[in-house]
Interface confidence: low
């Protein structure tokens, strides 16, 4: 940084004088103000005063024309000291070579050069490099050696010396702090290439420097205070859109907002996301709010950017007062599923149970009740009290509607809110068995031979549960015992029917009375087909012939 290439100056220069040759530059000027000076023959020793330096800018000045034949090379020393006179750099050797005269102009390789640099960078940061060529001899003379300079800067904000160009390499660097994309997004520099290392023929080009965005502006809430109204219990409900402004480049990480709920959300009821286009903060409910528990929440939301700030910036905070609106909430049956034991076959009008719901709302709402699903139509429900009564015969043995002794009913509770809301409950009636079914034989049709008849074994079934079942008893009625006998086996679950007298081939009714352990009696008529045959038969053969 604290070096300079040998400076070539053509002899017989016409001036005007003093003439700026090069700028001494110490990067220590970031930290302190620097004063520059030069020493050596041509400066402070004979021939004195040929060269001088602008002590504050470091510009090296030529005070009069040079005579190469008199002196071909000057060796000077550049010094940099702080305000208190302390040396901040080692002395720098400055070589000035007097060159031959020149008759060709330099040419830039492009009409327009383009480069970029981040806003807010420190002085000394390199931006871009420009190049010019010259047809003059650059081996034995400096006629073809090009020196670069900045002719002008547009705009001249915050001042007109924002950039410097390395005179020999063409590297353009930032020389001053204060690059601010939000104020000046682009600079146009008119650059010069001068042969004879800066004092020959000159040509110009344009260098366009784009100032790139850095996250040097914090997003700011506008407005900072919000009031919102949210119905209770709503999940995923948009509460409020929070608007921020950010001077950084739109749609960049330095502009895109990141929102954080800093306080007020004790129950973790809210969440906030960033809208991908508008950059707004969309505050929504993560859980349902409960008006009855808390009707107002005050949230504090902080906004930052996706990209970190490049310097310490104050963050903006918004306050959102969320008013929870009361909503007519559905009544809730207590318990949601109610198990009630009830005897089957209870009389019509007999109460079964009371099944009621509670309303979460604070005001005393009237709840009315209705049966929603009563597959067999056995029940009625008082709309005011929730009293469930029997209006049909509850039958545990009804396989169409009863499963595992349980009859399932769905009931509805409706409040008188506007609009009304409804809740459902399940009533599980466990039907207690009563001895309402007598035993029944199977099969109820038999075929039997009237010669050496085979005993007919009939299974006994009873839809009731123990103890209203076996052991069973059998009895023949209506004179059936004249021709038949009926005996129950030892296990008590089958009846053996035997033909004890000869009957002609025909169909007869056998009146069989079966009773269970609880003496519930059931009379069944067995259709007996008697055939003219011997022993076992399934269907009657043709007419039987004796002999």
């Amino acid at each position: 940084d604290w070096v300079v290439a040998p400076i070539s100056v053509p002899e017989n220069g016409k001036g005007p004088f003093p003439q700026r040759l090069n700028q001494l530059k110490s990067n220590k000027d970031r930290d302190t103000k620097i004063f520059y000076s030069i020493t050596g023959p041509g400066a402070d020793s004979p021939p004195e005063g040929v060269f001088a330096v602008e002590k504050e800018t470091g510009w090296l000045l030529l005070n009069k024309p040079l005579d190469r034949e008199e002196i071909a090379k000057y060796e000077l020393f550049g010094h940099a000291v702080s305000e208190n006179g302390a040396s901040v750099e080692d002395p720098m050797n400055i070589s000035i070579i007097v060159t031959d005269q020149n008759d060709h102009k330099p040419k830039f390789t492009q009409d327009t050069f383009r480069g970029s640099v981040l806003e807010g960078v420190l002085p000394g940061t390199s931006v871009m490099q420009v190049t010019a060529t010259d047809e003059d001899d650059a081996i034995y003379t400096y006629n073809g050696v090009v020196a670069y300079s900045i002719h002008s800067q547009e705009p001249k904000d915050p001042h007109d010396l924002m950039f410097t160009i390395h005179r020999s390499t063409g590297t353009i660097s930032v020389i001053s702090s204060g690059l601010d994309r939000e104020k000046v997004p682009e600079y146009t520099l008119t650059i010069q290439a001068t042969d004879m290392d800066g004092d020959g023929s000159t040509t110009t080009a344009v260098a366009v420097v784009e100032i790139l965005d850095a996250n040097d502006n914090a997003p700011m809430f506008d407005p900072q205070k919000y009031e919102a109204h949210v119905p209770e219990n709503a999940v995923g409900h948009e509460v409020q859109r929070l608007t921020v402004t950010d001077l950084d480049a739109p749609n960049s990480p330095a502009w895109r907002a990141t929102y954080l709920i800093m306080g007020g959300d004790d129950g973790d009821h809210f969440t906030i996301t960033t809208h991908p286009e508008s950059n707004q903060g969309i505050l929504t409910t993560r859980k349902g709010l409960d008006f009855e528990a808390k009707n107002q929440h005050t949230l504090y939301v902080e906004v930052t950017n996706e990209a970190p700030f490049v310097l310490k910036l104050p963050t903006s905070t918004a306050t959102i007062v969320v008013h929870v609106e009361d909503v007519n909430e559905a009544p809730v049956f207590v318990p949601p599923s109610k198990v009630v034991e009830v005897q089957e076959g209870i009389p019509t009008g007999e109460p079964v149970c009371v099944y009621t719901a509670e309303d979460p709302d604070k005001e005393n709402q009237k709840i009315s009740y209705r049966i929603l699903r009563d597959p067999a139509g056995w029940l009625a429900m008082d709309p005011d009290s929730g009293q469930v009564t029997a209006v049909g015969t509850l039958d545990r043995e009804d396989e169409q509607f009863v499963r595992n002794n349980i009859y399932e009913v769905m009931v509805l509770a409706m409040d008188n809110g506007s609009p009304p809301t409804t809740g459902t409950g399940t009533l599980l009636l466990t039907l207690i068995d009563v001895n309402d079914h007598g035993p029944v034989p199977e099969p109820r049709q038999i075929t039997i031979c009237n010669q050496s008849p085979v005993r007919q074994v009939l299974n006994i079934t009873d839809k009731d549960l123990s103890p209203h079942t076996s052991p069973f008893q059998a009895q023949l009625t209506d004179d059936s015992d004249i021709y038949w006998t009926a005996e129950v086996n030892e296990e008590g679950d089958t009846v053996v029917l035997s033909l004890k007298k000869f009957l002609k081939q025909d169909t007869y009714d056998v009146h069989l009375s079966l009773s269970d352990h609880g003496n519930k009696e059931q009379l069944t008529v067995i259709r007996a087909t008697v055939c003219d045959c011997h022993g076992h038969v399934e269907t009657c053969p043709g007419p039987w012939k004796g002999g």
Epitope: S368, R370, L372, R373, P375, G377, A380, D382, P383, D384, M410, L412, P419, P420, T424
Partner: antibody, heavy 122, light 108 residues
Framework: QVQLVQSGAEVKKPGASVKVSCKAS????????MHWVRQAPGQGLEWMGI????????SYAQKFQGRVTMTRDTSTSTVYMELSSLRSEDTAVYYC???????????????WGQGTLVTVSS | EIVMTQSPATLSVSPGERATLSCRAS??????LAWYQQKPGQAPRLLIY???TRATGIPARFSGSGSGTEFTLTISSLQSEDFAVYYC??????????FGQGTKVEIK
């Protein structure tokens, strides 16, 4: 068989009230909910409200709240619909409709009255 | 409130042809949808309930299908007595019970 027989046509002046009756027969009156639906000339069907003939509880469409009253008389198996503060746009045929009973929560309308034309005109 | 939308508003069909009427709900009504037929000067008559079950005495040429939000009433071969206005109605969410605006089936 199920029958719903409604009262005859009415002509009313704006601001007046009208009371339409619907007599049910052929089924157990208190076991089925009854609805009222109206149809303006050349228009579609618009639900007005429901009454539970068993307990007399009601629910009305928001549009008619404060203007409509539905009642029942179990001794005659009749439901009534009274609409007050009549205006010309209340000119319509008013139907009673019985709510069917299935295992679903809410039900369709399986039987309808023949309709009562109410004309509101000054 | 669930909004029921029927299409088309008017359907011109020749006798003996097939007619297909559509009904769309603004949100799911499961299978709790009914179709009614209304002839001039008469009360509506229940045709279909539960989206697809024919009511007592309704001819087999009437059939319903669909569930959720999209429903169809099909009349397989139109008879002269079938020319009328047809309404769909949801009974899944109440109040209110809501009807479609109707589809008029007219002779082509």
């Amino acid at each position: 068989q199920v029958q719903l027989v409604q009262s005859g046509a009415e002509v009313k002046k704006p601001g007046a009230s009208v009371k339409v009756s619907c007599k049910a027969s052929g089924y157990t009156f208190t076991s089925y909910y009854m609805h009222w639906v109206r149809q303006a000339p050349g228009q579609g069907l618009e639900w007005m409200g429901i009454i539970n003939p068993s307990g007399g509880s009601t629910s009305y469409a928001q549009k008619f709240q404060g203007r409509v009253t539905m009642t029942r008389d179990t001794s005659t198996s009749t439901v009534y619909m009274e609409l007050s503060s009549l205006r010309s746009e209340d000119t319509a045929v008013y139907y009673c409709a019985r709510e069917g009973y299935s295992s679903s929560w809410y039900d369709y309308f399986d039987y309808w009255g023949q309709g009562t034309l109410v004309t509101v005109s000054s | 409130e669930i909004v029921m939308t029927q299409s088309p508003a008017t359907l011109s069909v020749s006798p003996g042809e097939r007619a297909t009427l559509s009904c769309r709900a603004s949100q799911s009504v499961s299978s709790n949808l009914a179709w009614y037929q209304q002839k001039p000067g008469q009360a509506p008559r229940l045709l279909i309930y539960g989206a697809s079950t024919r009511a007592t005495g309704i001819p087999a040429r009437f059939s319903g299908s669909g569930s959720g939000t999209e429903f169809t009433l099909t009349i397989s071969s139109l008879q002269s007595e079938d020319f009328a206005v047809y309404y769909c109605q949801q009974y899944n969410n109440w109040p209110p019970w809501t009807f479609g605006q109707g589809t008029k089936v007219e002779i082509k």
